[in-house]
């Protein structure tokens, strides 16, 4: 038994162009949290397969509000470790998925909204009890930096947490053949129940008398390293078991570079040159492939058949982001024309069109005048999805069917009298006024406000302008 511990160091924009926009805004403050899922072995399991080794959820991070115009910084993180307890032996090799989630704290109906910001996955070798392993993973434009380790819970010890420790029976030393339990020097190893000679570092047992090997080791007692390539090191004595040279003391012996990386010695240590798709101190950090199921919400994974080639998610309409994890408000793109109302139904987009328009995007302007006649010599005018008639003089109404009373609106000003006429109306003006609608006063001195009186009329005559 033991605990896998994950420490998130930073989550923010990765290097290079195309920095992501901040996931939070002044209008929509948010906070981050993380989820880790662990599976045993290096098998290519579906993303949905259960987290057989366990899973954990972090606390919520501090609330963050974007500074307008500022690039997305490293985002504030939750405190503490993510801890995944495991009950049985630590498998030595494992697969992980780490998801970064955003909790939006705006005025959400029904509580906060959650959305996935990024998801990284990988496969690693790790011995329990070892130091923290550092890692960097990228998901689209985001970069996640983290460390992890597996530690045994007392009384278990060893690289697989299968050896047991017991308090000392004598104060000074352990019993015959039993060693102190590092780092618990005041305790002693419990008597081994594994097969005699089973490697305490590379073997473990769950039944008395057996010796099961951690990945990378073989032989009846798990003392023989599995040779991934023919003898890598020129140093050291030959091993009769494998016919290969056992690694000597040089920093590159045994090739610490994983995933086909090549090792070169440096004055102080070693350096790995990693193949495409891998990076990290020992080339242990791998790219996510399509087999990891990185595309959400129905996204299709294109390319990325192996870690050497980057994958791309083609997102269904309505989703975006490097993993199709962000929902787009498709109505914000204003797809409905001519004032149509947009409805995003999730599986489909619908436009409710105004009268006079049709089509999936209300793009068709119906011929409003088609089949519509205006009576009494009126002409049909299209406009705004509705037809109207421009009526001949003396007629009115929607279809020009009503005989109009031209005097109904009292068009003659200043007390002028209105007379209906076959060609319209005539105003008989009160003394002192003139004009077609009796709108102009006649000045007392006989001058008119008009530039000139119409020919044949003296100022002051009753006006019969038509």
């Amino acid at each position: 038994a033991g605990v896998f511990e994950l420490q998130i160091h930073s989550f923010g924009p990765g290097p290079g162009p195309g920095a992501p926009r901040s996931p939070c805004s002044a209008r929509l403050p948010c906070r981050l949290f993380f989820r880790v899922c662990l599976k045993p072995g290096l098998s290519e399991e579906a993303a949905e397969s259960p987290c057989a080794l366990g899973a954990a959820l972090s606390a919520r991070g501090p609330v963050y509000t974007e500074q307008p115009g500022a690039p997305a910084p490293d985002l504030p993180l939750p405190d503490g470790l993510l801890q995944v307890p495991f009950r049985d032996a630590w498998p030595g090799t494992f697969s992980f998925i780490i998801e970064t989630w955003r909790e939006e704290l705006g005025d959400q109906i029904g509580g906060p909204a959650w959305s996935l910001l990024a998801r990284v996955a990988g496969r690693r070798r790790l011995a329990a009890g070892g130091p923290w392993a550092r890692d960097i993973q990228r998901a689209g434009a985001w970069e996640l930096r983290f460390s992890y380790r597996a530690r045994c819970e007392p009384p278990a010890v060893g690289t697989a947490c299968t050896r047991l420790c017991r308090p000392r029976s004598a104060p000074s030393r352990c019993g015959p053949g039993l060693r102190p339990c590092a780092p618990l020097e005041d305790e002693c190893e419990a008597p081994l129940v594994c097969r005699a000679g089973c490697s305490p570092e590379h073997g473990f047992c769950e039944q008395p008398g057996e010796c099961r090997c951690l990945e990378g080791w073989t032989g009846p007692l798990c003392t023989v390293p599995v040779s991934t390539s023919s003898c890598l090191s020129p140093r050291g004595p030959s091993s009769a078991t494998t016919g290969c040279l056992v690694p000597g003391p040089g920093p590159c012996d045994g090739n610490p570079c994983a995933n086909g990386g090549s090792c070169s010695e440096t004055p102080r240590s070693f350096e790995c040159t990693c193949p495409r798709g891998f990076y990290g101190l020992r080339c242990e950090v791998s790219g996510v492939t399509c087999a990891d199921g990185p595309c959400f919400n129905g996204g299709l994974c294109v390319g990325g058949a192996d870690p050497d080639s980057a994958y791309i998610c083609h997102c269904p309409p309505g989703f975006q982001g490097s993993n199709c994890e962000k929902r787009v408000d498709r109505c914000s793109l204003q797809p409905c024309r001519n004032g149509g109302l947009c409805l995003d139904l999730g599986h489909a987009l619908r436009c409710r069109c105004r009268a006079g328009f049709a089509g999936p995007r209300c793009e068709h302007d119906l011929d409003d005048c088609a089949g519509r006649a205006c009576a009494n010599g009126g002409t049909c005018v299209e406009g705004g999805g509705a037809h109207r008639c421009s009526c001949a003089l003396g007629f009115g109404g929607r279809d020009c069917r009503e005989r109009a009373d031209p005097c109904a609106a009292r068009p003659c000003a200043h007390g002028g009298r209105c007379y209906a006429h076959f060609s319209g109306l005539v105003c008989a003006c009160a003394p002192g006024y003139m004009g077609a609608r009796c709108e102009f006063p006649v000045h007392p001195d006989g001058a008119s406000a008009l530039p000139a009186a119409p020919p044949g009329l003296r100022p002051g005559d009753p006006q019969r302008y038509l």
């Epitope: 129905g298 299709l300 083609h314 599986h347």
Partner: antibody, heavy 118, light 108 residues
């Protein structure tokens, strides 16, 4: 209701280019991905490729070197061109839209048989 | 690419019987992105299920879809005369999009 209709010559000579057009009604071409699928007589379905109005395309690797798919948003149409055809390209060619829930095929055209023969 | 193998190739049953169709993938179909189609002679295929188990519009509930990983199943609980057709599965998790070879459900 989305409706699709394939059109184009039913007979193409070997080594020539097969050209088909799919006319879409009941949906805007900019709302979906649009795809071509074919089915040789008496055989199963084979995906050819798809296009999005933005220009994103993806093709079946087995046909990629010979396929062009284009879209005409003004006519609400998309087209397929398959070059250097052989008799093995004889098939019923379907156009279809890809669903909003993922890259499966929601609505299909009725299909058009293209025979490659001299 | 993901190869989908459908079995059996032909299923001979009588109306009212239960039909069980299998679709097996050469590698895990990520996120259960698998669809089923029905095709009748002279017609285009018709979508039955997506996401392995989500029924498409207007599909009767005698049809059910299930499965994850590499194994998927389409069940027709009681065959109706109009159900005799060819059924195809299709994965849409990893490009290229691929179809199974089909299962023909014929009248016994």
């Amino acid at each position: 209701q989305v409706q699709l209709h394939e059109s184009g010559p039913g007979l193409v000579k070997p080594s020539e280019t097969l050209s088909l057009t799919c006319t879409v009604s009941g949906a805007s071409i900019s709302s979906y991905y649009w795809s071509w699928i074919r089915q040789p007589p008496g055989k199963g379905l084979e995906w050819i490729g798809y296009i999005y109005y933005s220009g994103t395309t993806n093709f079946n690797p087995s046909l990629k070197s010979r396929v062009t798919i284009s879209v005409d948003t003004s006519k609400n149409q998309f087209s397929l061109r398959l070059s250097s055809v052989t008799t093995a390209d004889t098939a019923v060619y379907y156009c279809a839209n890809l669903a909003l829930t993922g890259f499966h095929f929601d609505y299909w055209g009725q299909g058009t048989l293209v025979t490659v023969s001299s | 690419q993901i190869v989908l193998t459908q079995s059996p190739g032909t299923l001979s049953l009588s109306p009212g019987e239960r039909a069980t169709l299998s679709c097996r993938a050469s590698q895990s179909v990520t996120r259960g992105y698998l669809a089923w189609y029905q095709q009748k002679p002279g017609q285009a295929p018709r979508l039955l299920f997506y996401g392995a188990s989500n029924r498409a519009t207007d599909i009767p509930d005698r049809f059910s879809g299930s499965g994850s990983g590499t194994d998927f199943t389409l069940i027709i609980s009681r065959l109706e005369p109009e159900d005799f057709a060819v059924y195809y599965c299709q994965q849409y998790g990893i490009s290229p999009l691929t179809f199974g070879g089909g299962t023909k459900v014929e009248i016994k």
